[in-house]
Interface confidence: medium
C-alpha cells in the first residue's frame, strides 16, 4: 500500500564539489546549496516534523494497539481532531529519516484506508478510493566521493546533488477509475 518509488530525477550539472569531513560537520549541507532551498522550512513535509515531534511523548512508550488499519469514524470523537483524523480518507504521518538526504527528516502521509469512510455509517466503503496527494520537493542527496582523484571514495567525504522527490502530503477521496 506504499509506493516505494518516491524518488525523482537528479538535477545536477558538472562535477559537484567533494566536501571533506572537516569542511562539513556531520548532518550538515553546503550553505550555497541550502540557499537554493531557502523555503524548506515552509514546506509542509518539513514543517510537520517539528510539530509532530514537539507533540510526541519523547521516547517510546506503551500505546494502544489499533486493531484495524482503516478506522471507524465516530463524529463525537473527532470534533476536535486534525484534518488527517477527520477526513473520510484519513491518513497518518510517518516521519521518514534518511541520513543521506537534506532535510534528513520529512513527514510522509500514508492513507489508512483503501476505500473511503461513509459519512453516514462511519465505516469504510469500497465504492470510493483513498488516494495520496503528492508534492514535489527539492532535496539534497549526498554521495561518497573521492578527494584525491583516484575514484575510490574518501572516508567521510561527500558530494551533494539536488533532486526532486514526490512526497505524499495527504489523502483525498475519489471515485474509482472503473466500477
Amino acid at each position: 500500500h506504499h509506493d516505494p518509488s518516491l524518488r525523482g530525477h537528479p538535477h545536477s550539472h558538472g562535477t559537484p564539489h567533494c566536501y571533506s569531513a572537516e569542511e562539513l560537520p556531520l548532518g550538515q549541507a553546503p550553505p550555497h546549496l541550502l540557499a537554493r532551498g531557502a523555503k524548506w522550512g515552509q514546506a509542509l513535509p518539513v514543517a510537520l516534523v517539528s510539530s509532530l515531534e514537539a507533540a510526541s511523548h519523547r521516547g517510546r512508550h506503551e500505546r494502544p494497539s489499533a486493531t484495524t488499519q482503516c478506522p471507524v469514524l465516530r463524529p463525537e470523537e473527532v470534533l476536535e481532531a486534525d484534518t488527517h483524523q477527520r477526513s473520510i480518507s484519513p491518513w497518518r504521518y510517518r516521519v521518514d529519516t534518511d541520513e543521506d538526504r537534506y532535510p534528513q527528516k520529512l513527514a510522509f502521509a500514508e492513507c489508512l484506508c483503501r476505500g473511503c469512510i461513509d459519512a453516514r455509517t462511519g465505516r469504510e466503503t469500497a465504492a470510493l478510493n483513498s488516494v495520496r496527494l503528492l508534492q514535489s520537493l527539492l532535496v539534497l542527496r549526498r554521495r561518497p566521493c573521492s578527494r584525491d582523484g583516484s575514484g575510490l571514495p574518501t572516508p567521510g567525504a561527500f558530494a551533494f546533488h539536488t533532486e526532486f522527490i514526490h512526497v505524499p502530503v495527504g489523502c483525498t477521496c475519489v471515485l474509482p477509475r472503473s466500477v
Partner: antibody
Amino acid sequence: QVQLVQSGAEVKKPGSSVKVSCKASGGTFSSYAISWVRQAPGQGLEWMGTIDPFFGKTYYAQKFQGRVTITADESTSTAYMELSSLRSEDTAVYYCARDVSSISYYFHEYYSDRFDYWGQGTLVTVSS
Amino acid sequence: DIALTQPASVSGSPGQSITISCTGTSSDVGGYEYVNWYQQHPGKAPKLMIYDDSYRPSGVSNRFSGSKSGNTASLTISGLQAEDEADYYCQSTDPHSTVVFGGGTKLTVL
C-alpha cells in the same frame, strides 16, 4: 560509514556472566538507539533489548528481564550487554545493531524499530 | 507478544520471482505496525533489505520489494540470482515496544 565493532568471542561457565561491548563510529551515537539481538546455532534471530541513550531508557524482552543489563557510555560511543546466570542454551552469536525508530502519528504515536547497521557478532559459548 | 509466521523454505530458479510471506494478526501486521525484512548469509550479520513495509534502503537492489495486505507482509525478489540464496527474516514491533522476528525463511536458488 557507520560501523559497529564488537568485542571478541567468549567461553563461559554455566552460572557466570558475560559482558559484550559494541563500539560505534561514523555517526552521532546519542541520536540512535542500540539493540542487542542473538542467534543460537542454526536458529533464528531473537531480540534481547534496546538502549536509547538520548532518552536514557532501556527496554528488555520479557524472556531476558532480570538477566540482561544493557548500558551505554556516550563518551566512548560504546554500548554494552551483560547477561548473567548463563546456561548452555545461551550459547549463541550476539549482535548489536543500530536501531532507528520510525514514528507514525494518527491519534497516538506508533514506534517501529528497524536495524540498519549491525556489528560483526560475538560468539558466546557456555560450557562446563 | 506477537508472533510472525514465515514459511520455513522457498526455492526458485535464476531469473524467476519468488515471494516470502510474513503473517501476523490484525493488531500488529494488519494494524499500524510496520514490517522490516533482513537478509542473512551463512556466518554473516543480517542486512536490512526493506523497511516500513515497502521502503528500500539505499544500496539495496530494486529487485527486492516489500508490500503489505491485511495481516500479511510480503517480500518479493524478482530476477532471482545465485547470491540471493540466504535466510530472510521479517521483523516488527508490537504495541508494547517489543521487537519480534519471524522464524526465518531459507531461500534456495536452484
